[in-house]
């Protein structure tokens, strides 16, 4: 398998967080140090991910802090693994008409989901909201990802690589940050704009119409803000 350790690849973009979203809440997919995968209502150091795109719409998803790949077993359970298995740790990425993204195992066909149900992906299906994801640029200060052991002497380059195995804390030549539309700043609760008084789009309704089509800013973040 070419490039059997995608962690070493140079085509990783910036840190992002994958989150499910309804009109009322959002859960960020996080990969814990012990390999457990769940959702958190907010960005955490364990929900900071790197997503590497491969040929034919395949992606490899890695938790930066856990140093684990997102993988799936034959029952559809998702987990984080230090070992990269091409069959279990690559996912087919597809963008739905509503602008949300789904990820499914080409091997087992199950959807990546923060819900407990294991459902196979079928073309044209409308998956439940906890199986549909949006991406958001990391907002956690990078210092939180970098907790070196205190040393008396100046650290060497080798020490740096141990602390930052994915090389995400230093600028790199081939960074491909998320589109600006995905990381736009939104009004705060103190703003007097209509969006701020209805920050979750409650007045305008719920999930984006699955037949509305279109991507761009609306496809990237269909709702004004999630709590």
């Amino acid at each position: 398998y070419p490039n059997a350790s995608p962690l070493l690849g140079s085509s990783w973009g910036g840190l992002i967080h994958l989150y499910t979203a309804t009109a009322r809440n959002s859960y960020h997919l996080q990969i814990h140090k012990n390999g457990h995968v769940d959702g958190a209502p907010h960005q955490t150091i364990y929900s900071a991910l790197m997503i590497r795109s491969e040929d034919a719409g395949f992606v490899v998803i890695t938790g930066v802090m856990s140093r684990r790949y997102l993988c799936m077993d034959f029952r559809g359970n998702i987990f984080g693994s230090h070992y990269f298995d091409p069959e279990n740790c690559r996912f087919q990425h597809q963008t739905l008409e509503n602008g949300y993204d789904v990820y499914h195992s080409p091997q087992y066909h199950f959807l990546v989901s923060l819900g407990r149900a294991k459902r196979a992906f079928l073309p044209g299906m409308n998956p439940p909201p906890y199986s549909q994801f949006l991406s958001r640029r990391n907002e956690i200060p990078l210092i939180h990802f970098n907790t070196p052991i205190p040393r008396r002497h100046t650290q060497s380059a080798e020490d740096d690589s141990e602390r930052d195995p994915l090389n995400v804390l230093k600028p790199r030549a081939r960074m491909t940050p998320a589109p600006a539309s995905c990381s736009q700043e939104l009004p705060s609760a103190e703003d007097n704009s209509p969006m701020a008084s209805d920050p979750l789009g409650v007045v305008r309704g719920g999930r984006v119409n699955t037949h509305a089509g279109g991507t761009g800013p609306e496809g990237c973040r269909p709702f004004a803000k999630f709590i």
Partner: antibody, heavy 117, light 106 residues
């Protein structure tokens, strides 16, 4: 084990406010949204609102906009729901419930609020 | 917002009966539907999530089915402890509940 323990029954006069508490234990408080649901006597369940336990951000059902305030205290793993300008039709049992992405898996025991002059 | 309707609103049945309750959504909600059981004076109890998945600890006589707009809760053989009110709830956009179905003794 997960537990949501709510404050005791309240009797209030019309126009007053009531504040109900819900203390969580047995799990990481900041990892789950909390909801408030109420049930008038002999009636069905009515969703009131949701609070993000780490940011304190809230979203309420339109029916309660401006009357309900949800807060949380992370140091005690407690969420609060305050309902103001009470009227007789607010007489109900008020529940807190934990969100686990695809369901409300644990509920408080309920707090009976009676609004009567 | 999505509305949920349940039918019937109440039903009388005997122990051992097969009971079916339906929940209809005003628009498609995929499989994002939950069923709860509530007994008088008690908080609701989760039975089924994601339309058809049995919550841990719930007896296998309970089952759920459906997707999109039409959903069903079935109790294959009604037991004395099953007399209660059953609610559906959708998780697709807000968190709307159905009006409930009361199952009582015939």
């Amino acid at each position: 084990q997960v537990q949501l323990v709510q404050s005791g029954a309240e009797v209030k006069k019309p126009g007053a406010s009531v504040k109900v508490s819900c203390k969580a234990s047995g799990y990481t408080f900041t990892n789950h949204y909390m909801h408030w649901v109420r049930q008038a006597p002999g009636q069905g369940l009515e969703w009131m609102g949701i609070i993000n336990p780490i940011s304190g951000s809230t979203s309420n059902a339109q029916k309660f906009q401006g009357r309900v305030t949800m807060t949380r205290d992370t140091s005690t793993s407690t969420v609060y729901m305050e309902l103001s300008s009470l009227r007789s039709e607010d007489t109900a049992v008020y529940y807190c419930a934990r969100d686990i992405v695809d369901a409300f898996d644990f509920w408080g025991q309920g707090t009976m609020v009676t609004v009567s002059s | 917002a999505i509305q949920l309707t349940q039918s019937p609103s109440s039903l009388s049945a005997s122990v051992g009966d097969r009971v079916t309750i339906t929940c209809r959504a005003s628009q498609g909600i995929s499989s994002a539907l939950v069923w709860y059981q509530q007994k008088p004076g008690k908080a609701p109890k989760l039975l089924i999530y994601d339309a058809s998945y049995l919550e841990s600890g719930v007896p296998s006589r309970f089952s759920g089915s459906g997707s999109g707009t039409d959903f069903t809760l079935t109790i294959s053989s009604l037991q004395p402890e099953d007399f209660a009110t059953y609610y559906c709830q959708q998780f697709n956009d807000y968190f709307t509940f159905g009006p409930g179905t009361k199952v009582d003794i015939k």
